[in-house]
């Protein structure tokens, strides 16, 4: 058993049929010695008496808020949560496996630049009695500070018969140098509590590996005289690290017909303009990627040819 | 501690081309190592990230763009002084800091070159003959060093009398390639910045 936060405790349980329960001794936080009784949750029934209560925790029915009282007055609370371990593996019932980039990916994180700011998100089908708490650091043995905000519900989607909820959190490394070469990964730890079930999820990454620039901005077409060609121009996204001559991007320009089956013409360039042939009803899209370190491409910025 | 925004004459910055070749070569070599050594811990998640130049050179700090010198987190106290007479420099217009930056890059390349050559000698003794260093990568390191053209003491190639542990050598190769790729990215960024300045 360990303390998650004040008056909230996590009991770690081996979850197999013939596992014995965990013996837990609850102590009432009071100088009083006599006349102390214990109750659980909303029930007023006395579960035991005395300054300590010894219980066997084996099921979710044994978890909950234990309260000690004296003469109708509440003295203290202890909320017990369960953390299940099945076949040596901690349960992952609360969050959905996103399976990207690999199986057992519950947390996904992205950064728009090298400033040390990043966003992580996760999915669940649970809609109520759900809380998240996020902590992060650079490295684990001698951790350096990363500050995370509160996790918020960022999207709701309908997937077949189920509703899916996306939560996200923003974190910022306390003293980040955009030009630094990372040798210690960022660690992100999410505590998830659903009713009386506790689970924790972790992700470890280098900012350089989760970079995904915003799409190029101010995408414009300039027709060239007496030609089907157009000059496409764009700018670095505002959120990208500066100076741009140091944090350079490379771009992919794509001409896509109305039909998805039509052949796509693609051009790669380090410049912020390109000359392409604009077909009728086609659209021109441009996306960006770090020029020197191949992390993710940005989403496409698009304009119609017409 | 930073790179001033100087304006070298056109064509006076041949190092950019060499640094691009370097990044391409080390990236290809790392990809080859990851594929060939697929049953070894050779991915970014699996390896320990070691920097053989740590406390010996200060490339990131010495080559910091002017715009980032206002960022306190980028100003590290490590100082290293180097001999400064490189041919990538735009002669009279080059500041001391720019020379310090480029000589720091040169020292990095020299250190990695020695490590890679020593390692290759060991890998050539492996009866499995599983992996060797790409000669192109070693050549590209050499070309960039020549372009930087700093006079520096030659570091003797390390020789080892004991029987090499090939498993450990291959893991060390992965560690070295990952670190060198990260440094090659920094070098490329620096050269791009200097070229645009």
């Amino acid at each position: 058993i360990w303390e998650l936060k004040k008056d909230v405790y996590v009991v770690e349980l081996d979850w197999y049929p013939d596992a014995p329960g965990e013996m837990v001794v609850l102590t009432c936080d009071t100088p009083e010695e006599d006349g102390i009784t214990w109750t659980l949750d909303q029930s007023s029934e006395v579960l035991g008496s005395g300054k300590t209560l010894t219980i066997q925790v084996k099921e979710f029915g044994d978890a909950g808020q234990y309260t000690c009282h004296k003469g109708g007055e509440v003295l203290s609370h202890s909320l017990l949560l369960l953390h299940k371990k099945e076949d040596g593996i901690w349960s992952t019932d609360i969050l959905k496996d996103q399976k990207e980039p690999k199986n057992k990916t519950f947390l996904r994180c992205e950064a728009k630049n090298y400033s040390g700011r990043f966003t992580c998100w996760w999915l669940t089908t649970i809609s109520t009695d759900l809380t998240f708490s996020v902590k992060s650091s650079r490295g684990s043995s001698d951790p350096q500070g990363v500050t995370c905000g509160a996790a918020t519900l960022s999207a709701e989607r309908v997937r077949g018969d189920n509703k899916e909820y996306e939560y996200s959190v923003e974190c910022q490394e306390d003293s980040a140098c955009p030009a630094a070469e990372e040798s210690l990964p960022i660690e992100v730890m999410v505590d998830a509590v659903h009713k009386l079930k506790y689970e924790n999820y972790t992700s470890s990454f280098f900012i350089r590996d989760i970079i995904k620039p915003d799409p190029p901005k101010n995408l414009q077409l300039k027709p060239l005289k007496n030609s089907r060609q157009v000059e496409v121009s764009w700018e670095y996204p505002d959120t990208w690290s500066t100076p741009h001559s140091y944090f350079s991007l490379t771009f992919c320009v794509q001409v896509q017909g109305k039909s998805k089956r039509e052949k796509k013409d693609r051009v790669f360039t380090d410049k912020t303009s390109a000359t392409v042939i604009c077909r009728k009803n086609a659209s021109i899209s441009v996306r960006a990627q770090d020029r020197y370190y191949s992390s993710s491409w940005s989403e496409w910025a698009s304009v119609p040819c017409s | 501690r930073n790179l001033p925004v100087a304006t070298p004459d056109p064509g006076m910055f041949p190092c950019l081309h060499h640094s691009q070749n370097l990044l391409r070569a080390v990236s290809n070599m790392l990809q080859k190592a990851r594929q060939t050594l697929e049953f070894y811990p050779c991915t970014s998640e699996e390896i320990d990230h070691e920097d053989i130049t740590k406390d010996k050179t200060s490339t990131v700090e010495a080559c910091l763009p002017l715009e980032l010198t206002k960022n306190e987190s980028c100003l590290n106290s490590r100082e290293t002084s180097f001999i400064t007479n490189g041919s990538c420099l735009a002669s009279r217009k080059t500041s001391f800091m720019m020379a310090l930056c480029l000589s720091s890059i040169y020292e990095d390349l020299k250190m990695y070159q020695v490590e890679f050559k020593t390692m290759n000698a060991k890998l050539l003794m492996d009866p499995k003959r599983q992996i060797f260093l790409d000669q192109n990568m070693l050549a590209v390191i050499d070309e960039l060093m020549q372009a930087l053209n700093f006079n520096s003491e030659t570091v003797p190639q390390k020789s080892s009398l004991e029987e090499p542990d090939f498993y450990k050598t291959k893991i060390k190769l992965c560690i070295l390639l990952h670190a060198f790729r990260i440094r090659a990215v920094t070098i490329d960024r620096v050269m791009s910045y200097l070229n645009a300045s």
């Epitope: 049929p17 013939d18 596992a19 014995p20 329960g21 013996m23 659980l40 949750d41 909303q42 029930s43 029934e45 579960l47 035991g48 209560l53 010894t54 219980i55 066997q56 925790v57 084996k58 099921e59 979710f60 029915g61 044994d62 909950g64 234990y66 009713k195 | -």
Partner: antibody, heavy 119, light 107 residues
């Protein structure tokens, strides 16, 4: 006052289905799991299983798994035990009981439902 | 599963006497053992839990002791209403199991 009131005695033929009930009152129904115990004529007590009234989480005794089904209706604070195809060997007294949280034993018991299966 | 063996199967005693019933487990159940009393035509009633804790409303003449594999239920001075069948039950490991019962009869 804590009370578990069970449905009346049943006489059935082999192969028939049956569902007996246990209605709880006098306490917070969702705080306490409900269990079932069998007592064959002139025999001792046998633990069938327990069930959470919150989310219908169930722990069956392997000996009874597939033979009986436990269920619960939170809205009426009622637990059920059912058979899809009775056998003569199912003849017994069935007790529902309330599981004490933080312990696991049964602190309050229903009066029992006698089930007789005979052709 | 854990087998609980009660002894004796039948105990004959007189009112006012001390009665002791033993329950032995085939493997340790820590202190997670309960005792029940059942009278003819009635449902069992909880007497003792966690080996030695008396259920609320149970007279002080009933006491329990033991831990691990050996447990004892003691009735210090028998009253006429105490003649019944007594069962021990372990609730440490699933499936929870009961002893075969001890019949306490009037001598």
């Amino acid at each position: 006052e804590v009370q578990l009131v069970q449905s009346g005695a049943e006489v059935k033929k082999p192969g028939e289905s049956l569902k007996i009930s246990c209605q709880s009152s006098g306490y917070s129904f969702t705080t306490y799991w409900i269990g079932w115990v069998r007592q064959m004529p002139g025999q001792g007590l046998e633990w069938i299983g327990i069930m959470s009234p919150v989310d219908s989480d169930i722990r069956y005794n392997p000996m009874f798994r597939g033979q009986v089904t436990m269920s619960v209706d939170k809205s009426s604070s009622t637990a059920y035990l059912q058979w899809s195809s009775l056998k003569a060997s199912d003849t017994a007294m069935y007790y529902c009981a309330r599981r004490r949280p933080g312990q696991g034993y049964f602190d309050f018991w229903g009066q029992g439902t006698m089930v007789t299966v005979s052709s | 599963e854990i087998v609980l063996t009660q002894s004796p199967a039948t105990l004959s005693a007189s009112p006012g006497e001390r009665a002791t019933i033993s329950c032995r487990a085939s493997q340790s159940v820590s202190s997670w053992l309960a005792w029940y009393q059942q009278k003819p035509g009635q449902a069992p009633r909880s007497l003792i839990y966690a080996a030695s804790n008396r259920q609320s409303g149970i007279p002080a003449r009933f006491s329990g002791s033991g831990s691990g594999t050996d447990f004892t239920l003691t009735i210090s001075s028998l009253e006429p209403e105490d003649f019944a069948v007594y069962y021990c039950q372990q609730y440490n490991i699933y499936p929870y199991t009961f002893g075969q019962g001890t019949r306490l009869e009037i001598k």
